[in-house]
Interface confidence: medium
């Protein structure tokens, strides 16, 4: 069971300082942006991180949403990352959900975060380069200290 607590507005960056945004095709991508670019591209660069209490505490349970033309929430259904047109729900009556991730700080690096899927244990949000695009994907942690699954989260409230 997950029960919604509060929400924060955040900018999410990978460890190369690229900013996560949602493109016109609703794809989550990373791109080099100055602070000014980041502001100019709002609301596509500002994410609503909603925190949930977890009946089985396993880290901070969160959803990641964006408010563009509609509210869309990040999902890892079938291990494929996409934004689904839906609100972060008030309650989820299950111990796993495609939209719930466990946000945890990287041991020894309090400012670096990882997001583990609640549906797929051991799978994390990651940044992966595909041709010219830097994409947000779901990836199994295969090595300790994998930088691709580490992010910084800057509160904008």
């Amino acid at each position: 069971y997950f029960g919604k607590l509060e929400s924060k507005l955040s900018v999410i960056r990978n460890l190369n300082d690229q900013v996560l945004f949602i493109d016109q095709g609703n794809r989550p991508l990373f791109e080099d942006m100055t602070d000014s670019d980041c502001r100019d591209n709002a609301p596509r660069t500002i994410f609503i991180i909603s925190m949930y209490k977890d009946s089985q505490p396993r880290g901070m349970a969160v959803t990641i949403s964006v408010k563009c033309e509609k509210i869309s929430t990040l999902s890892c259904e079938n291990k494929i990352i996409s934004f689904k047109e839906m609100n972060p729900p008030d309650n989820i009556k299950d111990t796993k959900s495609d939209i719930i991730f466990f946000q945890r700080s990287v041991p020894g690096h309090d400012n670096k975060m990882q997001f583990e899927s609640s549906s797929y244990e051991g799978y994390f949000l990651a940044c992966e380069k595909e041709r010219d695009l830097f994409k947000l994907i779901l990836k199994k942690e295969d090595e300790l200290g994998d930088r691709s699954i580490m992010f910084t989260v800057q509160n904008e409230d």
């Epitope: 029960g3 919604k4 607590l5 509060e6 929400s7 507005l9 502001r39 100019d40 591209n41 709002a42 609301p43 500002i46 609503i48 949403s65 408010k67 563009c68 033309e69 509609k70 509210i71 047109e85 839906m86 609100n87 972060p88 008030d90 904008e156 409230d157």
Partner: antibody, heavy 125, light 107 residues
Amino acid sequence: QVQLQQSGPRLVKPSQTLSLTCTVSGGSISSGGYYWSWIRQPAGKGLEWIGSIYYSGSTYYNPSLKSRVTISGDTPKNQFSLKLSSVTAADTAVYYCARTPAYDGDARADFFDVWGRGTLVTVSS
Amino acid sequence: DIVMTQSPSTLSASVGDRVTITCRASQGISSWLAWYQQKPGRAPKVLIYKASTLESGVPSRFSGSGSGTDFTLTISSLQPEDFATYYCQQSLYPPWTFGQGTKLEIK
């Protein structure tokens, strides 16, 4: 049809705490889908959002007032309340309570669709 | 905070006129904008939300348009009851902020 009725003292002394209550009829503050908000308007000036409370108890405050504001809900009485501490003459305004449709996929979100009639609160010794 | 700037501050018009009020946001807010009408001594009343969606019960002479940073409220044919002050409000992210208001008065 939801209606909001405001109550509370209209005169508050400087440095004291302003307290107002909004009673909701025709709907429940404990059902999801809405925030319950406070907005103020100094005489002859524009509107300023103070803060909102969700049925779950989550609160959202204007950063410019956050250190002085508390919004709370009383589900059995179907009321929500505003407390603003350490008031000065600059806090003299008409205070409104309002209902706010929450984040919603169909986009009815984060505006103020039902308002109380407003209470003029004067801060003066 | 997102700053909302309305123009003009005051607008003089006559019954039957078509009038337009503009609102500019300090950053892109997509379509997350609402318009309100306020008469003296009364609470504001929402007219339009999501930039162009007419609130239930609001006359069709009111319309809204725009996206990003620039928005307009249009009254196609002014009626005597439309003389009031109009406010825009961004509904993208808190803190929710309002424009300073446009007073629509009789010419």
